[in-house]
C-alpha cells in the first residue's frame, strides 16, 4: 500500500482571510517542509493535489475547482479564492505525489467577517514607529501576487473608521502611509483597502495593522538600576525575612532582550544552597520603555547570609550594569540593666 509522509496540521500557519475578498494561499510544503520548490517538483513529474476538511466535520474532500466563475482555482503551488466565502473555513491539505512518492501537510484557514469600520477577529500585525524620529512609512502588507504590475490599483487608507485625508502628520502615498513625525496620538489601527479590476470584476483587499509608537533609539540609554542604591541599607536580624528589590529601567530598543538577574557572592541563586526565591514583575510605559523588578527574598536570614554580597545585574543591547545592595546585620539595642549600668561604672 502507498505510504504518505504526513506532516500533520501545521498550526503555526493560522491563516486568516476576509470574507468576500480574494485570497492566495501557498502550499506550505515548499516553504517549511521540503527541500525543493514547486518548479523542481513539477518538472520531476510530481502532482500537487488539494483537499479540504469542513470546519464541522473530519472527512477530507477534494476541492471543487468547477465552481461558477472559477471561484476556487489552483495555479502552480497557490490555491486561489476569487473571492472567499464564510463557509470556506476549514483545514486545507496540499499533497505532493507520484506513483512512488507522497508528502502532505494540512493547515487551518479561517474566513472572518469585518464590520464597516474594519473591526474583526483577525489577528493584526504590529508595526512600531519611533517617537519624534522624522519621516517613517508603513506599507500595505500581503498584496503581492494578487494583480500584475500592469494593473494600477486604487488604495485608500483609514485610521480606525476614518479615511485618512488632510491629517496633520499622516500622508497616504499609494501603497505607503507616511508619518511625518510620529506621536503617541498616532497609535491605532490603520487599514489599506486595495481595489483592482480582474476579468471584468472588481476585487477589494483589506489589510489592517496596528501602529504602536515606541521610544526612539536617539533617546535610548543603557539600563538604569534604581534599586538597590547607596541610600538604602537592608539591615536585618538573623531569623527575619530579607527582601531586596532590584528595579531596572530599560529604554525601548527594537528586538533587544532585556535581562535582570541577581548574584549572591558572585554566583547565580540556583547555584548556591541557601533558600532564596526571586519574583519578577514587568511594567511598560506608553512608548514601551520597560521597568523590571526582581525581588530577592530569603525567608529566614542567617548571620552568614547577612555577610554575603548581593548584586543586581541588568543587560540590554545598550550595555550591562550592576549594583550591589547594602546588607548588614542589625546591631542589637543594648539592654539597660546590664550594658548601660556597666557603662556608668556601677559595681
Amino acid at each position: 500500500s502507498e505510504r504518505c509522509d504526513d506532516w500533520g496540521l501545521d498550526t503555526m500557519r493560522q491563516i486568516q482571510v476576509f470574507e468576500d475578498e480574494p485570497a492566495r494561499i501557498k502550499c506550505p510544503l515548499f516553504e517549511h517542509f521540503l527541500k525543493f520548490n514547486y518548479s523542481t517538483a513539477h518538472s520531476a513529474g510530481l502532482t500537487l493535489i488539494w483537499y479540504w476538511t469542513r470546519q464541522d466535520r473530519d472527512l477530507e474532500e477534494p476541492i471543487n475547482f468547477r465552481l461558477p466563475e472559477n471561484r476556487i482555482s489552483k495555479e502552480k503551488d497557490v490555491l486561489w479564492f476569487r473571492p472567499t466565502l464564510l463557509n470556506d473555513t476549514g483545514n486545507y491539505t496540499c499533497m505532493l505525489r507520484n506513483t512512488t512518492y507522497c508528502s502532505k501537510v494540512a493547515f487551518p484557514l479561517e474566513v472572518v467577517q469585518k464590520d464597516s469600520c474594519f473591526n474583526s477577529p483577525m489577528k493584526l500585525p504590529v508595526h512600531k514607529l519611533y517617537i519624534e524620529y522624522g519621516i517613517q512609512r508603513i506599507t500595505c502588507p500581503n498584496v503581492d501576487g494578487y494583480f500584475p504590475s500592469s494593473v494600477k490599483p486604487t488604495i485608500t487608507w483609514y485610521m480606525g473608521c476614518y479615511k485618512i485625508q488632510n491629517f496633520n502628520n499622516v500622508i497616504p502615498e499609494g501603497m505607503n502611509l507616511s508619518f511625518l513625525i510620529a506621536l503617541i496620538s498616532n497609535n491605532g489601527n490603520y487599514t489599506c483597502v486595495v481595489t483592482y479590476p480582474e476579468n471584468g470584476r472588481t476585487f477589494h483587499l483589506t489589510r489592517t495593522l496596528t501602529v504602536k509608537v515606541v521610544g526612539s533609539p536617539k533617546n535610548a540609554v543603557p539600563p538604569v538600576i534604581h534599586s538597590p542604591n547607596d541610600h538604602v541599607v537592608y539591615e536585618k536580624e538573623p531569623g527575619e525575612e530579607l527582601l531586596i528589590p532590584c528595579t531596572v529601567y530599560f529604554s525601548f530598543l527594537m528586538d533587544s532582550r532585556n535581562e535582570v538577574w541577581w548574584t549572591i557572592d558572585g554566583k547565580k541563586p540556583d547555584d548556591i544552597t541557601i533558600d532564596v526565591t526571586i519574583n519578577e514583575s514587568i511594567s511598560h510605559s506608553r512608548t514601551e520603555d520597560e521597568t523590571r523588578t526582581q525581588i530577592l527574598s530569603i525567608k529566614k536570614v542567617t548571620s552568614e547570609d547577612l555577610k554575603r554580597s548581593y548584586v543586581c545585574h541588568a543587560r540590554s543591547a545598550k550595555g550591562e550594569v550592576a549594583k550591589a545592595a547594602k546588607v548588614k546585620q542589625k546591631v542589637p539595642a543594648p539592654r539597660y540593666t546590664v550594658e548601660l549600668a556597666c557603662g556608668f561604672g556601677a559595681t
Epitope: 502507498e2 483537499y51 464541522d56 466535520r57 473530519d58 472527512l59 477530507e60 474532500e61 491539505t93 499533497m95
Partner: antibody, heavy 116, light 111 residues
Framework: SLEESGGRLVTPGTPLTLTCTVS????????MSWVRQAPGKGLEYIGV?????NLYYASWAKGRFTISKTSTTVDLKMTSLTTEDTATYFC??????????????WGQGTLVTVSA | AAVLTQTPSPVSAAVGGTVSISCQSS????????LSWFQQKPGQPPKLLIY???ILASGVPSRFSGSGSGTEFTLTISDVQSDDAATYYC???????????FGGGTEVVVK
Amino acid sequence: SLEESGGRLVTPGTPLTLTCTVSGIDLSSYAMSWVRQAPGKGLEYIGVIGSSGNLYYASWAKGRFTISKTSTTVDLKMTSLTTEDTATYFCARYTIDSGIYTYDLWGQGTLVTVSA
Amino acid sequence: AAVLTQTPSPVSAAVGGTVSISCQSSQSVYGNNELSWFQQKPGQPPKLLIYGASILASGVPSRFSGSGSGTEFTLTISDVQSDDAATYYCAGGYSSTSDNAFGGGTEVVVK
C-alpha cells in the same frame, strides 16, 4: 467499477486481506468504504479511507481492521478473525455531491467464512 | 457511535399502494440531511435510492421519495410495484466519520 476479492474459508485467528480493485475511478479524488453483511443480517459500517488517505474506522473495528490503498486498489486487512466476522464484505465508493456524502457505487462483495 | 433504528420488519404493501419506512438516528446526521436510503435484493449489493435525505439518485423512479431532517427520516414508496419487494436500509453520515452507521433494515413484502 469495483470488484472485491480475497474472501475465503479461514480458521479463527487467521489474518486475511481483502482487495477492492477499481477501474475508471481516481482514488485520489474519492473516499472509499468497506461495509460488511453477515448472512441474513443487515449492513455494518467498517470504515472509510479518505481521498487524501486519512482513515476513519467504526469504534468496534479499530485495531483489528486496517484499510489502505494504492492507485488502483483498496485493501482491508483483518486480524484475529472470529466466527462473528463471517460475512460478505463490500467495498463502496463514498462520494460527495453538493457537500453530502453517500455510498453511490458498490462492488458485488466477497464472502469470508470463519470456521473451525 | 451513532445508532440508526428502522421500522420493524416486515412491512406489507399492496401493489399500487403506498408504504412508508422510518429511520431514527441517535444523533443528528451531518448538516441535518446526510442520510441515504438503499434497496437490497437477495444476492445483490445495495443500490442507492436517495441521498441528502430527499435527493433522488440517478435512474431511480420518482415513486421513491425521502423526507426528514436531523434525527427523523422517512422513505416513501408510492404506487408500489412487485419489483419493489426488497430490504431497505438507511445510512447516516456524521461530523465524525467514525460514527457512520447503517440502520438494521426493513423488509418490504408486496402482496
